[in-house]
Every structure is written in structure tokens, then in C-alpha cells.
């Protein structure tokens, strides 16, 4: 039997059973999540569940830019440092940078400081690039 690799929407890239869309338009975290959902297929702001996944995403984004942080699907909805992925994935893999997590910073971004391999918390109302993900 020939097993076909699933195809992703135009402009999205495929890695290990998932499709990823990197958007260089500026949205706050909640508007970014709404836009990801609008693409259908069960898309959400991206969960990053392993170092391999993080490295693949970071390499892809670095081909476009190396300075702008990017929203991912990790947030702290209760504002109690109880972080969770918006797509319901288990919060096991963690890649926080050493930056402080205090204040009003309840949404996570891939930080450009370490080539997008580590995360920082930031204020959810900031307008930033964002990364969507779905399983085709």
C-alpha cells in the first residue's frame, strides 16, 4: 500500500502529522486564536510538545525573520501561573526562557532572543506575529 502524506493548506508547512501556518500579520493573542480557528480543520494557536517540534518550527520561522516574537497557544487563563495549551494538549514539554513570568503576562510567545527555541510570557493584548497548527 502507498501511504500518502496529508497535504496542508496553501502557505502552511507539514511536520510529523501536523500542519503549521506562520502569520506575519499583527494580532493580540485572543484575535490570533480567533483567526487560527477561522481557518477550520480544528486549527488553534500552536502547541509545541517536544524539542524536535520546537526545532523544526524555529528553523522554518528563522527563514523569514529573526527579530519578532510570535504568539503560540500557551496561556494562563486563570492568571495563576497555571499554563495550558489552547488546543487541549498536555502541558508536559516546557521551554521557558529565564525571563520573569510576573506582572500581567499571561500569554506565551516564542522568543526571538534564542532563535525561537524558548518561550517568554507577555501581555496578551500586544499585537504580534502568530503560529497556527492543525492535524490534517
Amino acid at each position: 500500500d502507498i501511504i500518502m502524506r496529508p497535504s496542508c493548506a496553501p502557505g502552511w508547512f507539514y511536520h510529523k502529522s501536523n500542519c503549521y501556518g506562520y502569520f506575519r500579520k499583527l494580532r493580540n493573542w485572543s484575535d490570533a486564536e480567533l483567526e487560527c480557528q477561522s481557518y477550520g480543520n480544528g486549527a488553534h494557536l500552536a502547541s509545541i510538545l517536544s524539542l524536535k517540534e520546537a526545532s523544526t518550527i524555529a528553523e522554518y520561522i528563522s527563514g523569514y525573520q529573526r527579530s519578532q516574537p510570535i504568539w503560540i497557544g500557551l496561556h494562563d487563563p486563570q492568571k495563576r501561573q497555571q499554563w495550558q495549551w489552547i488546543d487541549g494538549a498536555m502541558y508536559l514539554y516546557r521551554s521557558w526562557s529565564g525571563k520573569s513570568m510576573g506582572g500581567n503576562k499571561h500569554c506565551a510567545e516564542m522568543s526571538s532572543n534564542n532563535n525561537f527555541l524558548t518561550w517568554s510570557s507577555n501581555e496578551c493584548n500586544k499585537r504580534q506575529h502568530f503560529l497556527c497548527k492543525y492535524r490534517p
Epitope: K25, N28, S30, L34, N125, K126
Partner: antibody, heavy 122, light 110 residues
Framework: QVQLQESGPGLVKPSGTLSLTCAVS?????????WSWVRQPPGKGLEWIGE???????NYNPSLKSRVTMSADKSKNQFSLKLSSVTAADTAVYYC???????????????WGQGTLVTVSS | QSVLTQPPSASGTPGRRVTISCSGS????????VNWYQQLPGTAPKIVMY???QRTSGAPDRFSGSKSGTSASLAITGLQSEDEADYFC???????????FGGGTKLTVL
């Protein structure tokens, strides 16, 4: 009630730098808002110059980006605009405004300063 | 030249309905909510409609907003003399990542 007040020279010489400050009262620039500058040449429409967040991150109008610098001073609860290499085409009423996120989606400028006329002339 | 296109003028008699259009593209109106600002002579703009169809608390319920594809419109019913002003549409544009405005429509109440 949030109030914004622009201040700065009303006359700037060509090739000089336009500098304006917006003082915020009744609210904090450290709130989850963007703080923006918009200008309006006499008898014409509105043009967005750019915006700043209290942490210093900025978004600028691409057509003005090379000449614009914005900054925020949390201790004085104010933010500022600098526009370099000005010409007569930069003559306009300059407004500062607060941008708020909508509960549905998007942003809008809900509070504006009264505006200050800056004339570029020798 | 404004990114968003509005008619330069519109008019109506008291009590009638008037509509102001705002035309854009897929990267601005087609992808983002639209705001409408009212500017009375010699004053700063004031938000009257945000997120395309959300009226601000200070705006009369005679004002309504809508959007279809890459065009938006502001409708004012029961036109009153105090509605006479300039109206500007605005939205975010994803292509340059910037706020863009329409050129403005001068509304005259005859």
C-alpha cells in the same frame, strides 16, 4: 475619565525634527493599551503615524518609518513622537490617542487629545 | 491617496436615512473589523462605531455599521442636524501592518 494633552513647538524649520509629547491623565500608560499618533493636514484626511506599547515596542506607518521615533515614559505617564527631516508636507494637526482592544475583535481609538497644529516653515 | 475609499460627500434631509460607504481590499476590510470616527468642525475625531457593527455608548442608536467582503458602510437613520460632520472609516491593514483610514465623507444635513 482618561484625558490626553499634546504639547510641543507649533513651528518647526524644514529639515528639522518635530517633537511632541502626550501627557495622559485619568489613566496609566502602563495599562493594556496602545498609544498612538495620528495627523491631519489642514483640510485633509487622517493619517496614522504609529503606536507604542508601554514596554517600548512600536509599530510605525511604513511610509514614515524611516523618520519616526516613539518613546514612552512611565514615570511621567506620557509618550512622545519625534519626526525627523520635516518638510512643508508634514504641516498638520497632530493628535495623540489611546487604542483599546474590542471585546469582539480588533482595536479602536477611544480617547483622543484635542490636537496641536504644527507648521513646518522657515 | 487614501488606502480606503469613501465618497467625499453625502447629504440627506432631516429624518431620512443616509449611508456612507468605505471600500478596501482583502488585506484590510476583508480581514479586519472596521471603525468609524465622527469629526465635528475644529474638534478631534470621536469613535462612533467599532468592530464593524458595535455602537459606542455615546453614539445614538440611529447609527449602525455593517460589512460585506471588502466594503463597509455606516448607516444613519432619522438624520438630525447634529449629525453634520466628517466621517472616517478605519481598519488595520495586514499587508503593511498599519492602521489605514478612508479619505473621509462630509455629511451635510439639508
Amino acid at each position: 475619565q482618561v484625558q490626553l494633552q499634546e504639547s510641543g513647538p507649533g513651528l518647526v524649520k524644514p529639515s528639522g525634527t518635530l517633537s511632541l509629547t502626550c501627557a495622559v491623565s485619568g489613566g496609566s500608560i502602563s495599562s493594556s493599551n496602545y498609544w498612538s499618533w495620528v495627523r491631519q493636514p489642514p483640510g485633509k484626511g487622517l493619517e496614522w503615524i504609529g503606536e507604542i506599547y508601554h514596554d517600548g515596542s512600536t509599530n510605525y506607518n511604513p511610509s514614515l518609518k524611516s523618520r519616526v521615533t516613539m518613546s514612552a515614559d512611565k514615570s511621567k505617564n506620557q509618550f512622545s513622537l519625534k519626526l525627523s527631516s520635516v518638510t512643508a508636507a508634514d504641516t498638520a494637526v497632530y493628535y495623540c490617542a489611546r487604542d483599546s482592544p474590542s471585546y469582539s475583535s480588533g482595536w479602536y481609538s477611544d480617547y483622543w487629545g484635542q490636537g496641536t497644529l504644527v507648521t513646518v516653515s522657515s | 491617496q487614501s488606502v480606503l475609499t469613501q465618497p467625499p460627500s453625502a447629504s440627506g434631509t432631516p429624518g431620512r436615512r443616509v449611508t456612507i460607504s468605505c471600500s478596501g481590499s482583502s488585506s484590510n476590510i476583508g480581514s479586519n473589523p472596521v471603525n468609524w470616527y465622527q469629526q465635528l468642525p475644529g474638534t478631534a475625531p470621536k469613535i462612533v462605531m467599532y468592530s464593524t457593527d458595535q455602537r459606542t455608548s455615546g453614539a445614538p442608536d440611529r447609527f449602525s455599521g455593517s460589512k460585506s467582503g471588502t466594503s463597509a458602510s455606516l448607516a444613519i437613520t432619522g438624520l438630525q442636524s447634529e449629525d453634520e460632520a466628517d466621517y472616517f472609516c478605519a481598519t488595520w491593514d495586514d499587508s503593511p501592518n498599519a492602521v489605514v483610514f478612508g479619505g473621509g465623507t462630509k455629511l451635510t444635513v439639508l
